[in-house]
């Protein structure tokens, strides 16, 4: 706390301006009045303060807005933003997307601090869910963005909000939270023709059902190894080798590249080796010729 | 020891055709791709698409797609790639390679077509 | 298609010296599953058939002397020469085999300074 000190005879501010650079710390708190710093704002920015003199400026500002700051000093807070703490920004109501841009801005080029998740999170509650226009925004800044929410909260993103997400975006998603998206792209980009509707769909497959790839597989799309990778194993296991070469149309050939890894491993061991052998990579690993395959899952669920 | 041996020079006139060959020893030939890959007089290499000689099924650069034809015949451990539609720019250095994974392991070579009339 | 980027274009390298050559993809060619970026180097030697190098951005093809190295992920390769033997005059291309049409960089022309 700032001790009350009476302001010095002729220092009075009388606006926000560099002659307040030489004030020490208890005459900014005695000689600049919070409704004018308030109403100056956007003029703090251009003022090299040090760190200490924004901790009285916002000092200032709480004793002001001790319910939260309004909108109007929010969207001029510049690198004042990065003095608040969580605490503080759960007291604000932020509804436009220009104040979020702002102070997005602040901390760009940083990792997400607890205080932009904070923002983001009472934001996006605000609006009630992600439209395009703030995902757009929030994974041009953080193209992790979409990954760091709960399969809950990804079931408010209307599908429409799916055109503004770029491949990178998903990049670090998990299966569950593929599982969410994939239906909401499905549904996006519905209208799409074969080869336009595979390019943008590709990067949501790994919450494809296996269903949907059996019926990717007779379109041509020449899916690459790297995407067949992150398909759901439990997707990829029932495909027949028929399936996959379509599916994968010249990367096929991969697969003896990457035969120690998951899906491929698991999906060569429930291959008939006659069947691996037309593929022509020297698969080995296929169920033997002759041997009859029992689901056990199957029988169980029957008993 | 994998080899892989191709057929001899060819001169070819515009909207020719030329059918050249690569025949494979050393190795399983069912258990790994062909690839065929270009290269024209001073330039960098083009990949002209691949064949699985398990079932003859192929798959070309679409640059290529129209004209290009790619056939194996198993019982001498042999494919070809046809080039049809000649043109001067097709003069170049045409090699067969075969995959190691997906990387060209072994390379033939290599068939100098001519294209001029 | 993908784009290879190679640079420079020509290197020349004192005997004993080490070679760095570059190669940019315009987009990854890291399969983010297995950990693998698919991408190869090869040496042409004048008036021979290329030869396997590198595969896998840095695992070596046996056979292929260790002063041959490849390093990097995503868009960014390199391939050094650590000491530059006179054998070692040729030209080196990368390639990608992440999708088809498999693509290849311009080459980059390693001269005895």
């Known amino acids: 706390e700032v001790e009350k000190t009476a302001c010095p005879s002729g220092k009075k501010a009388r606006e926000i301006d560099e002659s307040l650079i030489f004030y020490k710390k208890w005459e900014l708190e005695a000689c600049v009045d919070a409704a004018l710093l308030a109403t100056q704002m956007d003029r703090v920015n251009a003022i090299p303060f040090t760190y200490e003199q924004l901790d009285v400026l916002k000092h200032k500002l709480d004793e002001l807005y001790p319910q939260g700051y309004p909108e109007s000093v929010i969207q001029h807070l510049g690198y004042l933003f990065l003095k608040m703490s969580p605490e503080d920004i759960r007291k604000w109501n932020v509804t436009s997307l220009e104040t979020l841009k702002a102070l997005l801005e602040v901390n760009k080029g940083h990792e997400m601090s607890p205080q932009v998740a904070t923002l983001i999170d009472r934001f996006v509650k605000g609006r009630g869910q992600l439209d395009k226009d703030t995902l757009d925004t929030l994974t041009a800044f953080y193209p992790g963005y979409l990954c760091s929410l709960s399969p809950e909260e990804l079931s408010s993103v209307p599908p429409s909000s799916i055109w503004a997400v770029r491949p990178q975006d998903l990049d670090t998603c998990d299966p569950r939270q593929l599982d969410v998206l994939y239906p909401k792209a499905r549904l996006a980009f519905q209208n799409m023709n074969g080869s336009e509707y595979f390019v943008k769909i590709q990067s949501f497959l790994g919450g494809a059902p296996t269903e949907d790839l059996k019926a990717l597989s007779q379109q041509n799309v020449s899916m690459d190894l790297a995407t067949f990778m992150k398909l759901r194993t439990d997707a990829v296991l029932p495909l027949t080798v028929a399936e996959v070469q379509k599916l994968l149309g010249p990367h096929v050939e991969g697969l003896k590249a990457e035969e120690r890894h998951r899906p491929v491993r698991d999906w060569i061991l429930r291959q008939r080796q006659d069947d691996l052998d037309t593929l022509g990579l020297g698969l080995q690993g296929g169920i033997p010729n002759g041997y009859l395959v029992l689901d056990l899952s199957m029988q169980e669920a029957l008993s | 020891e994998v080899q892989l041996v191709q057929s001899g020079a060819e001169v070819k006139k515009p909207g020719a055709s030329v059918k050249v060959s690569c025949k494979a020893s050393g190795y399983t030939f069912t258990n790994y791709w062909m690839h065929w890959v270009r290269q024209a007089p001073g330039q960098g290499l083009e990949w002209m698409g691949n064949i699985n000689p398990s079932s003859g099924d192929s798959y070309y650069n679409e640059r290529f797609m129209s004209r290009v034809t790619m056939t194996v015949d198993k019982s001498t451990s042999t494919v070809y790639m046809e080039l049809s539609s000649l043109r001067s720019e097709d003069t170049a250095v045409y090699y067969c390679a075969r995959s190691g994974g997906l990387w060209l392991a072994f390379w033939g070579q290599g068939t100098l077509v001519t294209v001029s009339s | 298609d993908i784009v290879m980027t190679q640079s420079p274009d020509s290197l020349a390298v004192s005997l004993g010296e080490r070679a760095t050559i570059n190669c940019k993809s315009s987009?990854?060619?890291?399969?983010?599953?297995?950990?693998?970026?698919?991408l190869a180097w090869y040496q042409q030697k004048p008036g021979q058939s290329p030869k396997l190098l590198i595969y896998f951005a840095s695992t070596r093809e046996s056979g292929v002397p260790d002063r041959f190295s490849g390093s990097g992920s995503g868009t960014d390769f390199t391939l050094t020469i650590s000491s530059l033997q006179a054998e070692d005059v040729a030209v080196y291309y990368c390639q990608q085999h992440y999708r088809t049409p498999y693509t290849f960089g311009g080459g980059t022309k390693v001269e005895i300074k």
């Open positions: 987009q990854t060619l890291l399969n983010s599953v297995s950990q693998n970026n698919y």
